[in-house]
Each structure stands twice: as structure tokens, then as C-alpha cells.
């Protein structure tokens, strides 16, 4: 839009807002059980972990903000089996952490998730 | 879980992680048109804005993280009507910003959205 019609400061604020909404890795709360694939008798404590996942807007409505690079970070969680026959076990769970994002036209066939050791 | 079984530092790290995943207002990217209710001939630029929305985990699976208090913040956006007969108009769009969140058992009847002036 032509800058001549509007106050340059207003345009700057709008532009900064747009930049902040762009597709990038954002800290997200992820439910471990859902990511792992729910098992009715296995629970985790805490049930959620913080990781970075791609999110935000793209320059085109038809594009999807998706991860292009991923690192796996290990989270220490209590694994609880029901019925509780033993002490909850402290296990390392590897969670996908998106380190790079890109606006892409199609969803990948194999979305990154969680790897259990 | 009894702290005697585990290293106190490990427990502290787990607890901090859990606190950070708790239900609270989080900065979120929101698509304005979707929030407003899509009109085929009215578009916004930028199409997305940053606001705080309730998100995160609850202690029980049956609870949902929902807003208990909301403020409305005004965002300056270009409103584009199609077919484009005039210069895109700079309009104030009021967007719901969640200021308080709580883990509640049911979804509210009227989710907060966007108010147009």
C-alpha cells in the first residue's frame, strides 16, 4: 500500500506486527502422551513439556508453516504404569524441537514427533 | 512421588518444566479473517496479529485451559474490499487478548473473538 496515504509511523507499527507473526520456531506446550501415541495404561508426569514448534503466518494463504530442521531434546519424565505395581520410573523421552521453519505448499508425509529410547 | 528416590536437582528441573507448561496466557498468532468469520470479499493486511491467548496443560485430562478475563486491544489493519474500488482503508480492529486463564471442566458458550468498530 502506498506509504503516501498513511502516517509512516503507523505503517512501521503494522509492518513490525506482521514481521512478528511470520512463520518461525515458537515455544509450545506439547502433551507427551498425545505425541507418543496414547497408551491407555501409561501416563507421564509432567504430562506436558515445552519445546519449539513451527508456527505463525505465511505470505500466502495456501502455504503452511512447517519444520525444515529438527533437533531432539531429552526430557526427564516420570513414566507411570496403571495399575501402579512399582515406583514411577524416571525415563528420558526425546522430543522433537523445531530449529528451522519454512512456508511450504504441502504437508510432509512423516511429521516429526517423539522418539522413545 | 517421594523425593527420597530421586536426585533433588532432577526433581527441581522437572517441576520447573511443569510450571512452565501450566495453563496461562501465551503469545499467539491469530488469523484475523478466521476470527472475524470469513467474508469472501473482505480481507486484512497483515492477515495475522499477535495476541495473548490461554494455552498450556491442566492437572486433569477432563479440564480445559480457558480464559477467565479478557481485554480488547486495538490493532491497526488495512481492510481490503474486493473488488478493490478504493484505496485500502486503515481500520481499528479490536482483538480479544486473554489476561487470565483457568483450568475449567467445560468450554464457554460464547468464545471471545474480535469486535469490529
Amino acid at each position: 500500500f502506498a506509504a503516501t496515504f498513511y502516517d509512516i509511523e503507523t505503517l512501521k507499527v503494522i509492518d513490525e506486527e506482521w514481521q512478528r507473526t511470520q512463520c518461525s520456531p515458537r515455544e509450545t506446550c506439547v502433551e507427551v502422551a498425545s505425541e507418543l501415541g496414547k497408551s491407555t495404561n501409561t501416563f507421564f508426569k509432567p504430562p506436558c513439556v515445552n519445546v519449539f514448534r513451527c508456527g505463525g503466518c505465511c505470505n500466502e494463504e495456501s502455504l503452511i508453516c512447517m519444520n525444515t530442521s529438527t533437533s531432539y531434546i531429552s526430557k526427564q519424565l516420570f513414566e507411570i504404569s496403571v495399575p501402579l505395581t512399582s515406583v514411577p520410573e524416571l525415563v528420558p523421552v526425546k522430543v522433537a524441537n523445531h530449529t528451522g521453519c519454512k512456508c511450504l505448499p504441502t504437508a510432509p508425509r512423516h511429521p516429526y514427533s517423539i522418539i522413545r529410547r | 512421588f517421594a523425593a527420597t528416590f530421586y536426585d533433588i536437582e532432577t526433581l527441581k528441573v522437572i517441576d520447573e518444566e511443569w510450571q512452565r507448561t501450566q495453563c496461562s496466557p501465551r503469545e499467539t498468532c491469530v488469523e484475523v479473517a478466521s476470527e472475524l468469520g470469513k467474508s469472501t470479499n473482505t480481507f486484512f493486511k497483515p492477515p495475522c496479529v499477535n495476541v495473548f491467548r490461554c494455552g498450556g496443560c491442566c492437572n486433569e485430562e477432563s479440564l480445559i485451559c480457558m480464559n477467565t478475563s479478557t481485554s480488547y486491544i486495538s490493532k491497526q489493519l488495512f481492510e481490503i474490499s474486493v473488488p478493490l474500488t478504493s484505496v485500502p482503508e486503515l481500520v481499528p480492529v479490536k482483538v480479544a487478548n486473554h489476561t487470565g486463564c483457568k483450568c475449567l471442566p467445560t468450554a464457554p458458550r460464547h468464545p471471545y473473538s474480535i469486535i469490529r468498530r
Epitope: N59, E61, S62, T106 | -
Partner: antibody, heavy 118, light 112 residues
Framework: QVQLVQSGAEVKQPGASVKVSCKAS????????MYWVRQVPGQGLEWMGY????????TYNQKFKGRVTMTTDTSTSTAYMELRSLRSDDTAVYYC???????????WGRGTLVTVAS | DIVMTQTPLSSPVTLGQPASISCRSS???????????LHWLQQRPGQPPRLLIY???NRFSGVPDRFSGSGAGTDFTLKISRVEAEDVGVYYC?????????FGQGTKLEIK
């Protein structure tokens, strides 16, 4: 108003490279993807790829992958398209086109004729 | 790649009469988000293409209301209610649902 001003016509030898520029004005350059489309004289339109000026991310048509590079200079609001290893069938008018959030190529440059001949 | 097939390739029309161009895609153009990214472009002789219609039926800025777009899935139509002399040129359909973006081969509109 939105304007896309392209560089002038070029004549190149087979095997050489060409770099076409497209200077944008009248809008926020980083808020829109820039497409590159070519048209062989008397023929239809062919999409080469696009660049997101916000972060430099590119998506190319597989047909041109390895031969084409799209870049931007946000300080001057200019997009560039470089095509390498030119062949005679690359003789075409090369257009830059801004793409709206809703998908249509809404503003076009006037085109740059690239002639490849020995 | 998505193949876009236009018919007819040439359309001689009398001034003031209607004209219709068809565009068929080799795959559905409905995006996973529910939108259909099918657009129509006009290219007058010696000029760059110009956007007429986007997302099937939305007329772009300054496009006369005699132009209209319709269709769904794989079959789309551009209609001109009353052809005027300035409408002479080549019309292209294009899709931006899939990569690579592709165009129809063009339909030449000429006056009888």
C-alpha cells in the same frame, strides 16, 4: 501505487548466465512473495519459482532447480533472478510478479527479454 | 505436475456478445484449508499478464463486472457477459494450490 520495474533486455551466449532485477515500490516488500514467470515468444506462461523476501526462503520449479537462483535485497526492495548455463530455448521474456496473500499474481513487471544466441 | 487444459484455444466473438472459456485441471484444486486457488489472467498484445479473477470468482481491482469466474474442484469457467474491443488478448487460467504453480496453455480471444 504498486510498481515493479524490471531491468533492460539482455543478449547472452549459450552457457552464460543472466541476472534480471525487479525493483518494487508502493508496498511493504517483505510482506509478499515474489514470483518469477517466463514466456517464450508466442507461447504460454511458465512458473520458475518464488522467493519470500522476509527471510530469503525460495521454492523453485524442479525444471529449473540447479540452474536458477532467486535473491532479494530488502534495503532497496529489489528481487533478482539469476539463470545459469543458458541455452537457446531459454530465450524468453522473464517477468517478476507480486503474489497476494490470497494467491493471485496481482502485480506484474513489464518483463525482461533475454535472448540466447551464439 | 498439475496439467491445466483450456478450451477453446481460440475464440472468435462478435462485439457485444458473450464469451466463455473453460479450464480443467488434472487434479482437484481444493486446498487442505478448503480454499480453491484457481485464478484467471488476461494478456493483451505486447503487455504483461494482468490478474482478472482470483480464488475462482473474486474480481481483482479495476476489473469490469462483465468478467465473472465460477467452478469447483477440477472444472472452472471464465465468462465475459458482453465482449468489448479492449478484451482482445490471451486468457490464462492458473493454479496456486500445488507446486509447481501451473498455467493453462491460453485461449486467444479475437473479434469476428
Amino acid at each position: 501505487q504498486v510498481q515493479l520495474v524490471q531491468s533492460g533486455a539482455e543478449v547472452k551466449q549459450p552457457g552464460a548466465s543472466v541476472k534480471v532485477s525487479c525493483k518494487a515500490s508502493g508496498y511493504t516488500f517483505t510482506g509478499y512473495n515474489m514470483y518469477w514467470v517466463r514466456q517464450v515468444p508466442g507461447q504460454g506462461l511458465e512458473w520458475m519459482g518464488y522467493i519470500d523476501p522476509y527471510n530469503g526462503d525460495t521454492t523453485y520449479n524442479q525444471k529449473f532447480k540447479g540452474r536458477v537462483t532467486m535473491t532479494t535485497d530488502t534495503s532497496t526492495s529489489t528481487a533478482y533472478m539469476e539463470l545459469r548455463s543458458l541455452r537457446s530455448d531459454d530465450t524468453a521474456v522473464y517477468y517478476c510478479a507480486r503474489t497476494s496473500y490470497y494467491g493471485g499474481m496481482d502485480y506484474w513487471g513489464r518483463g525482461t527479454l533475454v535472448t540466447v544466441a551464439s | 505436475d498439475i496439467v491445466m487444459t483450456q478450451t477453446p484455444l481460440s475464440s472468435p466473438v462478435t462485439l457485444g456478445q458473450p464469451a466463455s472459456i473453460s479450464c480443467r485441471s488434472s487434479q482437484s484444486l481444493v486446498h487442505s484449508n478448503g480454499n480453491t486457488y484457481l485464478h484467471w489472467l488476461q494478456q493483451r498484445p505486447g503487455q504483461p499478464p494482468r490478474l482478472l479473477i482470483y480464488k475462482v470468482s473474486n474480481r481483482f481491482s479495476g476489473v469490469p463486472d462483465r468478467f465473472s469466474g465460477s467452478g469447483a474442484g477440477t472444472d472452472f469457467t471464465l465468462k465475459i457477459s458482453r465482449v468489448e474491443a479492449e478484451d482482445v488478448g490471451v486468457y490464462y487460467c492458473s493454479q496456486s494450490t500445488h507446486v509447481p504453480r501451473t498455467f493453462g496453455q491460453g485461449t486467444k480471444l479475437e473479434i469476428k
